[in-house]
Interface confidence: low
């Protein structure tokens, strides 16, 4: 999996999007987890509604929210009040039974300076990435990481590496 970098600004919200094949993942709940180390487990942060048909309802765990557009095939995670400790490697997952398929590897970076944006305050920009495999950026300030990179960067924004 490529790693997409999303950069956000400390104190602001960062939106991470994970596109997927809506037919292939039909009926599956989704989850957002944080990678613990380069080869460690992925610790669940938040998952979509227990009832798949209600996946569009936003669910929160602390400052992290998740919502799933099951028809359009886009999982959206919102990190509210982004903080430096939020930086790191995450995964969007599709759940089936006790198994989980990785939809996207995400490197979240947190930028400290609000002036270090692209331009508009509501735009997301790409950030630096960690040692990951084939990372790439997306417009919500996201970008791809490279192979072998490790996920523990700073502030982040999202914008396909803008």
């Amino acid at each position: 999996h490529n790693t997409t970098v999303f950069q956000g600004v400390a104190g602001q919200s960062l939106q991470v999007s994970c596109p997927y094949d809506s037919m292939k993942h039909w009926g599956r709940r989704k989850a957002w987890c944080r990678q613990l180390g380069e080869k460690g487990p992925c610790q669940r942060v938040v998952s979509t509604h227990n009832l798949w048909l209600l996946s569009f309802l936003r669910r929160w765990n602390g400052s992290t929210a998740i919502t799933d557009d099951t028809l359009g095939g886009t999982l959206t995670i919102t990190l509210r009040n982004l903080q430096p400790h939020d930086a790191g490697l995450y995964q969007c997952q599709s759940l089936h039974g006790s198994e989980a398929d990785t939809l996207r590897k995400v490197l979240v970076e947190v930028l400290a300076d609000p002036l270090d944006h692209r331009d508009a305050g509501d735009l997301w920009f790409p950030g630096e990435s960690e040692s990951f495999e084939d990372a790439h950026v997306e417009h919500s300030i996201s970008r791809s990481l490279l192979e072998g990179e490790i996920p523990f960067p700073p502030t982040s924004h999202h914008h396909h590496h803008h």
Epitope: T3, A112, E128, A135, P154, H162
Partner: antibody, heavy 116, light 107 residues
């Protein structure tokens, strides 16, 4: 004013290691990734990797994994890059550059010469 | 890895000329493209970020355009001090990659 001050030139023997430094000032060191870039004589630029000073997280270009190791000392706002098992191919100028929207801030470069 | 190809490799221009430097990415990188100028024995200097965004302190004669995989750095009315090598950088995916550079000389 943001400044990145790199250590001086190094003349090292093949097979040896070298550790260079990049002292940052003018901003909060732990807030931005520090990147390292290689430029061989007369050649283009190669991104080596980066480190996030706040937690020591690193990311490497696969080409430089095993060759370069990035570390930081937060108390002195200094980033380090160690290169090991040096060969003539490692002779180059190495720059540190601060992250942001593009690399707006660069060190002056550290020239490493590998020669017997 | 994303390969960045710059053209021409070098060019010689007359002061006052308008110059266009090309950079092509091996795959779409949206507008995650940065331009740098490097003068002899100096560190690179950021000229343009995100394909077209200007940088404080950089003369207005430098401008950038493009999106996707094709990008252009334009210098409107070249000045003698603009000599150097110009690099484009993929800021979209890791590993970050740079073009081979375009060497600008003044006649």
């Amino acid at each position: 004013e943001v400044q990145l001050q790199e250590s001086g030139p190094e003349l090292v023997k093949p097979g040896a290691s070298v550790k260079m430094s990049c002292k940052a000032s003018g901003y909060t060191f732990t807030d931005y990734n520090m990147h390292w870039v290689k430029q061989s004589h007369g050649k283009s630029l190669e991104w080596i990797g980066y480190i996030y000073p706040n937690n020591g997280g690193t990311g490497y270009n696969q080409k430089f994994k095993g060759k370069a190791t990035l570390t930081v000392n937060k108390s002195s706002s200094t980033a380090y890059m160690e290169l090991r098992s040096l060969t003539s191919e490692d002779s180059a100028v190495y720059y540190c550059a601060r992250s942001g929207r593009g690399f707006a801030y660069w060190g002056q470069g550290t020239l490493v010469t590998v020669s017997a | 890895d994303i390969v960045m190809t710059q053209s021409p490799a070098s060019l010689s221009v007359t002061p006052g000329d308008r110059v266009s430097l090309s950079c092509r990415a091996s795959q779409s990188i949206s507008d995650y493209l940065h331009w740098y100028q490097q003068k002899s024995h100096e560190s690179p200097r950021l000229l343009i970020k995100y394909a077209s965004q200007s940088i404080s302190g950089i003369p207005s004669r430098f401008s950038g355009s493009g999106s996707g995989s094709d990008f252009t750095l334009s210098i409107n009315s070249v000045e003698p001090e603009d000599v150097g090598v110009y690099y484009c950088q993929n800021g979209h995916s890791f590993p970050y990659t740079f073009g081979g550079g375009t060497k600008l000389e003044i006649k």
